[in-house]
């Protein structure tokens, strides 16, 4: 029997055992976070599946994810939101230590989907494990990209107080207008709820003592934020290793000097 024709995309296919992974992560999350104990993970999976199954994977909309977003509604206390751009690992290491601050991946929906890929096919109920659309080579309205755009928008919209963002000082564009932070989150911070955005620019080189807060792209970020009536602050984190160590042990004598 000849296999049925299947669309070939440029990106890697759905992560193996995707349904099982999402369900297992959901259960683990709801067990660890008492405020989410009411969440029915089977319903979460059904809503997740409903967002992309049997839909053309280049025509996914934010509307498709609304049932899932509704089930995963969660609030972050004011002053406790940490956004990041191109420096995910350090941001996550930080919130693992500073347990009262939260990245999107510390929230249920972000946690469910972190590092996973998924897509379906139009008019079939199959999950495509062979290939999925690539954002650049195929289309931007693919299931994974639209998911992150949707939940990132919601995460930014619900932030309040002083919002922090971790930026990668090793990149040519420390602030990139085309990143999720630059294209979605920055524009969805609510001025009536957010007093300030504080950027932490993470230095890569050990001997790098330049003030990266003066970088043109940071000035561009400051301009965008200021125009939105949100105050802007910037800090250099010269020694990310020391920075994490001092978050763990703030009493350490070496933490009294600059990081």
């Amino acid at each position: 029997v000849l296999p049925r024709w299947r669309q070939q995309w440029s990106g890697s296919g759905t992560t193996s055992r995707f349904p099982e992974t999402v369900l297992a992560r959901c259960v683990k999350y709801t067990e660890v976070h008492p405020e989410m104990r009411h969440v029915d993970c089977q319903s979460v999976w059904d809503a997740f599946k409903g967002a992309f199954i049997s839909k053309y994977p280049c025509n996914i909309t934010e509307e498709d994810y609304q049932p899932l977003v509704k089930l995963g509604t969660q609030t972050v206390p004011c002053n406790k939101t940490l956004l990041w751009s191109r420096i995910k690992d350090l941001a996550h290491q930080f919130t693992q230590v500073q347990r009262d601050m939260f990245t999107l991946e510390d929230m249920l929906l972000g946690y469910l989907a972190d590092d996973l890929t998924w897509c379906g096919e139009f008019n079939t109920f199959e999950i495509n494990y062979q290939s999925c659309p690539d954002w650049r080579k195929d289309c931007s309205n693919n299931p994974v990209s639209v998911f992150w755009k949707t939940v990132s928008r919601r995460f930014a919209e619900t932030a309040c107080g002083v919002v922090h963002v971790m930026l990668n000082g090793s990149r040519s564009k420390i602030f990139d207008k085309n990143s999720t932070f630059g294209s979605v989150e920055v524009h969805n911070l609510q001025p009536e709820k957010v007093q300030a955005l504080e950027a932490w620019v993470i230095h890569g080189g050990r001997e790098d003592s330049r003030d990266l807060c003066q970088d043109p792209t940071i000035k561009e970020l400051e301009s965008i934020i200021s125009k939105r009536n949100i105050r802007f602050f910037c800090k250099n984190i010269y020694r990310p290793d020391k920075f994490l160590q001092c978050v763990k042990n703030p009493e350490d004598s070496s933490c009294l000097s600059g990081i």
Epitope: H38, D40, Q42, T124, F125, E126, I127, Y129
Partner: antibody, heavy 120, light 111 residues
């Protein structure tokens, strides 16, 4: 010991209603999805309905959609199947089953069944 | 007409190995959904034999084994015994129907 005990079966006229119950014991009831499966005399197994562990999602076979309602009371460790507009073809032994974990993992514990007869 | 297709009957002599097939489609077995197998002895409730394609619950002899390939699954019983005479059903989730589906059942006779 993990146990499921069905009750509520009996003889009912076509168009009538019946409510089946399934009392669960020996496991954390609110950690597992539950299902109803039936078997008409001399026939094979037919899945009827399922409900997720917190009751947020329900699923039905096309043959019972709109007529049967599955529900659960986690405080009482009890599963229910409300059957209305009953037809002769609904005559069967109805089994309550515990899902192995999720609704697509299968059912690892079954009750002994309760008989429903629809006849005038 | 069942969504999953099983042979209505199978037979073997004691000690023999028999295999029961279960054929599905891309919306159920072929869509990363697990297959489970059930044994129903005459006059009793079904019992889980195999779950997650090839896993045996505790208490099920290792003479029973399950496998899956593409849109089909099979149950193998080696060292057939007279007490294995029963009806066997395969089952899985169907994403098109959003429902659990069973095969029509296979009546195994030990000759």
């Amino acid at each position: 010991e993990v146990q499921l005990l069905e009750s509520g079966g009996g003889l009912v006229q076509p168009g009538g209603s019946l409510r089946l119950s399934c009392a669960a014991s020996g496991f954390l009831f609110d950690d597992y999805g539950m299902s109803w499966v039936r078997q008409a005399p001399g026939k094979g197994l037919e899945w009827v309905s399922a409900i997720s562990y917190k009751g947020g999602s329900t699923y039905y076979a096309d043959s019972v959609k709109g007529r049967f309602t599955i529900s659960r009371d986690n405080s009482k460790n009890t599963l229910y199947l409300q059957m209305s507009s009953l037809r002769a073809e609904d005559t069967a032994v109805y089994y309550c089953a515990k899902d192995h974990k999720w609704n697509y993992y299968g059912m690892d514990v079954w009750g002994q069944g309760t008989t429903v007869t629809v006849s005038s | 007409q069942s969504v999953l297709t099983q042979p209505p009957s199978a037979s073997g002599t004691p000690g023999q190995r028999v295999t029961i097939s279960c054929s599905g489609s891309t919306s159920n077995i072929g869509n990363d959904n697990y297959v489970s197998w059930y044994q129903q002895l005459p006059g009793t409730a079904p019992r889980l034999l195999i779950y997650k394609d090839d896993q045996r619950p505790s208490g099920v002899p290792d003479r029973f084994s399950g496998s899956k390939s593409g849109t089909s699954a099979s149950l193998a019983i080696s060292g057939l015994q007279s007490e294995d005479e029963a009806d066997y059903y395969c089952g899985t989730w169907d994403d098109r129907l959003n429902a659990w589906v069973f095969g029509g059942g296979t009546k195994l006779t030990v000759l």
